[in-house]
């Protein structure tokens, strides 16, 4: 069944998530109208290869035309209108950047399949096996289900055979004892010689049959244990390992991890089969104690079978003890694995063997750096204590799906103070944000006479003492989880591995897509690659060191790539989220590319991008204008920082931005958001209506107050040759001498600092045509 059709049949809660996937950049109507064709194209390839993207984009327009003519024949006016509008939009937006639409479609299709997968898992748990989405199971998983079913069947068959062998043995035992008690066995010389001989033959025959049956059972048990071992290996080394890797990816902003319920069902099923088999092996021992003979296969093989089944069950239980939710501070949900001392963090463990008899039986204890006491001292790492409720009993009541879990909600870390200010050793080789720590969870299971020690641990965490360490700590978490699936390599940063651009690019995009509604486009990523690696054509496979990513300053800058980018991420999330979600912020674009795309556009066309020189994160706009001689000029305003955006929204800044020309008249240089979206259409909805800007006048006053409006104004000279930001205080001297402003951002054309005027309060009040 086509993916789009499957999606239509989903539950409302999933449909809501589906709606969130689609926006103006790729309208849902288009997805609906061209569903089969869209699903037949290789969008991921198109997203990485310009020539293919161009081809697919042109084919897309062709498909739209065909669909349009179908609507024409059906006289469907509304759909005709919508389709024409969509086509115009696509042409205006993606004709020059077809890889962008390819990336968007690829992402949507991928997210759709994830949604189907999630729904399928949920449906399976809810017993809706006939639901169309339940079919979304990989071939490998189907095989696994098959193997598990086979194991269950073999266990049941053995159960039957055990009953049969027990019956045969009881019958043999009865006959043997009867003959013995009647003294027939000594009576071979008596009158009943032939009858007794006959009975003896029957008895021997029964013993032979018993021996054969025992051998058959022992052999089948050995085969069953091998089958269990195979299924267990698949479950733990593949499925569970995949889940753990996906958890790592989800931790660093990647796609959300699939739910553990299906895995829990599989593991529980296998564990149940193992316990039943263990009982069968115990039964063999009982049978052997009742009847044994020379060459008895039970005597020979039972101890080894017992050992194997116990080992399998023990290992399964150990593997089934997992950290379902990695340590995370509730105030920083999108940055797990970074913990600040003295701040509460939460974490959750789960046992994927869902045995009701274990409810409230397992007491979990949490500790930190359990196995590295001496190592830590040698390495000079800090040492910590866990404070708060560090023991919890696992139960099935707290979780909404009845899983056997324990959630720790009130844990905090405190550093163990030593004489030298907290570091266990003065010559510590790693900075604190590269120091990795493990949170360990321990418990003991007593089940059917077995004692099993369970232990699991979190992914490595970075412990900070000040929130200003968060960016570097998060960089460490990104680098670790991007490059290794080793769950406990705390020495990772003593020799950090090198990443490739492809890996880094994906993770950087996740930093946006996980907390906003859009990731980074190929074009945006190429700009970032240029910043990290210098000019190049193909960055795929290029290597990036940990130092280059996070520690070394960028060329000509006083800060690292990551510090700069992290501040931009923060800026986006806190100040310009809605505009970013709409796709209005081009964000990362090189000067050359900016000039290239704007120079062909009419005056007043502008784009929004991030500052390259602002460490704290800044956003600016660049626009096209014509100078007196009619020559095209590209101008940029001095970047707005968080400080300024605290006082006024970026949308309002854009809407109100003016240039004061030589005749002191205020004009707005910003007309169309690139490529050709009218400014009001793009930003109007994000500005407060003027009526809301001030409270009504004091009812007791004679006349209402005059309304005021903050606007940003750039004073400019006629020549438009100022290359650097202008400070309001030094405007005169700058105009006279044109001296350099420090930390300025070189620009393609003029770069202006805007002065913010309050039209009522400032003495240098400018009249604005509002």
């Amino acid at each position: 069944m086509a993916q789009w059709n499957q999606l239509q049949q989903l539950d409302t809660r999933y449909l809501e998530q589906l709606h969130q996937l689609y926006s103006d950049s790729f309208p849902m109507e288009l997805r609906q109208f061209l569903a089969p064709w869209i699903e037949s194209q290789d969008w991921a390839y198109a997203a990485s290869k310009e020539s293919h993207a161009t081809l697919v984009f042109h084919n897309l327009l062709g498909e739209i035309d065909q669909q349009y003519s179908r609507f024409l024949q059906e006289s469907n006016v509304l759909y005709q209108h919508n389709l024409r509008r969509i086509k115009q939009f696509l042409q205006s937006r993606y004709l020059e950047k077809p890889m962008e639409i390819a990336r968007i479609v690829a992402r949507c299709l991928w997210e759709e399949s994830r949604l189907l997968q999630t729904a399928a898992t949920a449906a399976q748990q809810g017993g809706q096996a006939n639901h169309p989405t339940a079919a979304v199971v990989t071939e490998k998983q189907q095989m696994l289900e098959q193997h598990l079913q086979d194991v269950r069947k073999r266990v049941q068959d053995l159960e039957q055979k055990m009953k049969v062998v027990e019956n045969l043995q009881d019958d043999f035992d009865f006959n043997y004892k009867t003959l013995k008690s009647q003294g027939d066995m000594q009576d071979l010389n008596g009158n009943n010689q032939s009858v007794t001989r006959q009975k003896m033959q029957q008895l021997e025959q029964m013993l032979t049959a018993l021996d054969q049956m025992r051998r058959s059972i022992v052999s089948e048990l050995a085969g069953l244990l091998s089958a269990m071992e195979y299924v267990q290996k698949t479950l733990t080394d593949e499925e569970l390992a995949d889940w753990k890797r996906r958890q790592q990816i989800a931790c660093i902003g990647g796609p959300p991890n699939i739910c553990l319920d299906r895995l829990e069902n599989w593991i529980t099923s296998l564990a149940e089969s193992q316990l039943q088999t263990r009982q069968q092996i115990k039964k063999l021992e009982e049978l052997q104690q009742k009847v044994s003979y020379k060459g008895d296969p039970i005597v020979q093989h039972r101890p080894m079978l017992e050992e194997r089944i116990v080992e399998l069950f023990r290992n399964l239980m150990k593997s089934a003890f997992v950290v379902e939710r990695q340590p995370c501070m509730p105030m920083h949900p999108d940055r797990p694995l970074v913990i600040k001392t003295g701040v509460q963090f939460t974490t959750k463990v789960r046992l994927l063997v869902k045995f009701p008899e274990l409810n409230y039986q397992l007491k979990i204890k949490v500790c930190i750096d359990k196995d590295s006491g001496d190592v830590a001292a040698l390495r000079g790492s800090r040492k910590f204590n866990i404070l708060g409720t560090n023991t919890k009993v696992m139960n099935m009541e707290e979780s909404n799906n009845g899983s056997l879990s324990a959630e720790f909600k009130h844990l905090t870390l405190r550093e163990q103070r030593c004489g030298n200010g907290g570091r266990a050793n003065c010559d510590a080789s790693l900075i604190v944000t590269e120091e990795l720590h493990l949170i360990t969870f321990e418990t003991e299971v007593y089940h059917q006479g077995l004692k099993i020690d369970l232990e699991t641990h979190s992914l490595p965490v970075v412990v900070i003492s000040n929130i200003c360490q968060m960016p570097n700590a998060w960089a460490s978490i990104l680098w670790y989880n991007m490059l290794t699936n080793n769950p406990k390599n705390v020495n990772f940063f003593t020799k950090p591995p090198i990443g490739t651009w492809d890996q880094v690019a994906e993770v950087l995009s996740w930093q946006f897509s996980s907390t906003t509604k859009r990731g980074l486009s190929i074009e945006q990523l190429t700009t970032l690659a240029e910043k990290l690696l210098g000019p190049g054509v193909n960055y795929s496979g290029c290597q990036i060191t940990w130092a280059k990513f996070c520690k070394e300053n960028m060329a000509g800058k006083g800060f690292s790539f990551w510090v700069w980018l992290d501040n931009i991420i923060d800026l986006v999330k806190k100040y310009i989220l809605a505009l970013w979600n709409e796709g209005y912020i081009m964000g990362f674009i090189s000067k050359e590319r900016e000039r290239a795309i704007l120079s062909t556009k009419p005056p007043g066309t502008f784009l929004l991008r991030f500052s390259e020189s602002s460490k704290e994160g800044g956003v600016t706009f660049t626009w096209v204008e014509k100078d007196i001689s009619g020559k095209t000029q590209i101008q940029s305003v001095e970047p707005y920082t968080k400080q300024q955006l605290n006082n006024m929204s970026f949308a309002e800044i854009i809407m109100g931005y003016k240039i004061m020309d030589a005749t002191n008249i205020l004009v707005s240089p910003l007309v169309y958001l690139y490529p050709d979206i009218p400014k009001e259409e793009a930003f109007g909805k994000y500005c407060r209506p003027e009526s809301q800007e001030h409270p009504e006048a004091d009812p007791g006053s004679a006349a209402p107050y005059l309304k005021t409006k903050f606007i940003c104004v750039t004073p400019t000279t006629c020549s438009n040759t100022i290359d650097l930001p202008m400070s309001p205080r030094t405007l005169d001297s700058l105009m006279q001498f044109g001296n350099n402003g420090e930390g300025a951002e070189p620009s393609a054309g003029g770069q202006f600092e805007s002065l913010t005027f309050d039209m009522e309060l400032t003495s240098e009040c400018a009249t604005s045509p509002m």
């Epitope: 039957q160 055979k161 062998v165 019956n167 045969l168 019958d171 006959n175 006959q198 049956m213």
Partner: nanobody, 126 residues
Amino acid sequence: EVQLVESGGGSVQAGGSLRLSCVASTYTGCMGWFRQAPGKEREGVAALSSRGFAGHYTDSVKGRFSISRDYVKNAVYLQMNTVKPEDAAMYYCAAREGWECGETWLDRTAGGHTYWGQGTLVTVSS
């Protein structure tokens, strides 16, 4: 589920001999033979319990028919001697998991589940 497969049926002259065999898919405590002549009800012929090795026979075949088992092969045999025309019938192998298979089973008043074979036909020519 126990599967039973009979063999050995065929035509035999009155006063002659015939040996019927039945192999079971698994061990059962009780195995025996029943028969059904056209237009008549099914009746018990002979049964052998795994306990005590004693065979039980319906009166009409006592001294002529003999039942035996091979525990290794999970088989039961019916040796038919001095066959009479009234012995002609469809012969069914039967088995049950319990070991009690005396007269109560043969006259089909015993409880418990009985497994049946497809039957093998015995005809008697005079």
